[in-house]
């Protein structure tokens, strides 16, 4: 028996070869002897039943001259899995067709962190092995059900599942979209008074995007978190539902989700969590956003630089007179200089690779008041 593997919804070609390599009489039948199609000597394809009943079955007329009389089955169904008989030259060739199907659980659009289950449907009597490869090259293998927990952004794309049966294989391609923000976390460094822009780009594109979202904010100085804004998303159009009075955030009307805080103030420094619930999806998308605010001030004879917000303990806060060595540098959130000399002072927040934030303050001779550029 020859074995042919097929994929549901696609086409399969069942071989039948003549030893004489020329056109001859042939008939394809089901195992119960019902005739499917054949050629009885006039070079004309004769179907065994009504056209509607047999419109999925065909042969390759162009191959007949070479002694090849394949049975083509289009739009394969799982129930096409059976034995087919080709009769020619007083002999019978049996061809076994096994149709397989690989499907993804419920939906091919899944939230980051959710599980993907790939299920193999196979004909009775078959014992296939299956291996699936993710777009980033991760291999999973097992029985008829394969699961991947904690889907990540890199899992978006075409998954290739290879079904192996009796040394023959058939390949399935399934497009999976992982719904997530492009970044899990971001941090914004701002001087006091500057406008703050928060952007939440999505890592996927879909025709219609509908849902609702909210930004919760935990200010460093506050004892509890607070909802800063809630919004709706309808077909990629953003509409604000509710916004706090302080701060009064503004939100862009189009994607990517974009929030503007009119002024960076110490009382706003902290961490936020933007959640987005999508229509017909269980669970939510999350992006963390952090705000660090710097303030440089001069009061009487004291020049002070402070930062608020979630900073790494490795960050260095420095005060220096322009073009001079730092007067003070500490891995702390506040530094100061007593009796600073006149000139342009710089407050710098830096790490091993760069200056993250800089604020300048002009110290005037002692009889004047300070000027902040």
């Amino acid at each position: 028996k020859t074995l042919v593997l097929g994929k549901e919804g696609e086409s399969a070609e069942l071989p039948c070869e003549s030893s004489q390599k020329k056109i001859t009489v042939f008939t394809w039948k089901f195992s119960d002897q019902r005739k499917i199609l054949g050629q009885h000597g006039k070079g004309v394809l004769i179907r065994g039943g009504s056209p509607s009943q047999f419109d999925r079955f065909d042969s390759k007329k162009g191959a007949w001259e070479k002694g090849s009389f394949p049975l083509i089955i289009n739009k394969l169904k799982m129930e096409d899995s059976q034995t087919y008989i080709c009769e020619l030259e007083n002999r019978k060739e049996e061809v076994e067709l096994w149709v397989f199907k690989v499907t993804a659980n419920s939906d091919t659009h899944l939230l980051q962190g959710q599980s993907l289950t790939l299920t193999l449907e196979s004909p009775p009597g078959s014992s296939p092995s299956v291996q699936c490869r993710s777009p980033r090259g991760k291999n999973i293998q097992g029985g008829k059900t394969l699961s991947v927990s904690q889907l990540e952004l890199q899992d978006s794309g075409t998954w290739t599942c290879t079904v192996l049966q009796n040394q023959k294989k058939v390949e399935f391609k399934i497009d999976i979209v992982v719904l997530a923000f492009q970044k899990a976390s971001s941090i914004v460094y701002k001087k006091e008074g500057e406008q703050v822009e928060f952007s939440f780009p999505l890592a996927f594109t879909v025709e219609k995007l509908t849902g609702s979202g909210e930004l919760w904010w935990q200010a460093e100085r506050a004892s509890s978190s607070k909802s800063w804004i809630t919004f709706d998303l309808k077909n990629k159009e953003v509409s604000v539902k509710r916004v706090t009075q302080d701060p009064k955030l503004q939100m862009g009307k189009k994607l990517p989700l974009h929030l503007t805080l009119p002024q960076a103030l110490p009382q706003y420094a902290g961490s936020g969590n933007l959640t987005l619930a999508l229509e017909a999806k269980t669970g939510k998308l999350h992006q963390e956003v952090n705000l660090v605010v710097m303030r440089a001030t001069q009061l009487q004879k004291n020049l002070t630089c402070e930062v608020w917000g979630p900073t790494s303990p490795k960050l260095m806060l420095s005060l220096k007179l322009e073009n001079k060595e730092a007067k003070v540098s500490k891995r702390e959130k506040a530094v100061w200089v007593l009796n600073p000399e006149a000139g342009m002072w710089q407050c710098l927040l830096s790490d091993s690779g760069q200056v993250l934030l800089e604020s300048n303050i002009k110290v005037l001779p002692t009889w004047s008041t300070p000027v902040q550029p």
């Epitope: 941090i187 952090n290 900073t311 260095m316 540098s329 830096s350």
Partner: antibody, heavy 122, light 107 residues
Framework: QVQLVESGGGVVQPGRALRLSCAAS????????MHWVRQAPGKGLEWVAI????????YYADSVKGRFTISRDNSKNTLYLQMNSLRAEDTAVYYC???????????????WGKGTTVTVSS | DIQMTQSPSSLSASVGDRVTITCRAS??????LGWYQQKPGKAPKLLIY???NLQSGVPSRFSGSGSGTDFTLTISSLQPEDFATYYC?????????FGQGTKLEIK
Amino acid sequence: QVQLVESGGGVVQPGRALRLSCAASGFTFSSYGMHWVRQAPGKGLEWVAIIWYDGSNKYYADSVKGRFTISRDNSKNTLYLQMNSLRAEDTAVYYCAREVALEGYYYYMDVWGKGTTVTVSS
Amino acid sequence: DIQMTQSPSSLSASVGDRVTITCRASQDIRNGLGWYQQKPGKAPKLLIYTTSNLQSGVPSRFSGSGSGTDFTLTISSLQPEDFATYYCLQDYNYPYTFGQGTKLEIK
């Protein structure tokens, strides 16, 4: 391509000094913090020191504090480790490594040299 | 200083196995942890940074998780080239400190 090449290793007596160099190429050296990491024979990795991109800040492991000095010359794209009062336990392969710092949040050593061997023995 | 305790110190496994290595910090280091792989006579190689971020070019069978004091490196399906020594490194604060290493050997 991005490369770090250590040199200056050798055999030295206890109490003596040695200076290691690390030549950087293929990237903007002055934009990165740089580390020294060592590994004693058959042992694990031990972090030694870091110097910031502009040389303004230096931090050391307790085991080398006061004896080793990390420095850099950005005009020569070179990192140094001055090792004084060497001890037998300083015997190790010394690696230099580049630190990537992103947003003051993500940190990692992505490029390493092949290492230079220092043997402290009488 | 922050101490890093890595376990196990050695581990025997077979190709195709799922392997987990853990690292515990003596104090909260948020997500300031990286994982490095080292083969005999070679320099260490970065695998994962800031707890869960896969370094470019590193196979996706490597993944990291955790937060605070407990962290995990997982290799989903061991390949022959994965037999090496693995180190965690806390880069949350100075001085940086490595775990003592986990030697992954062929069973």
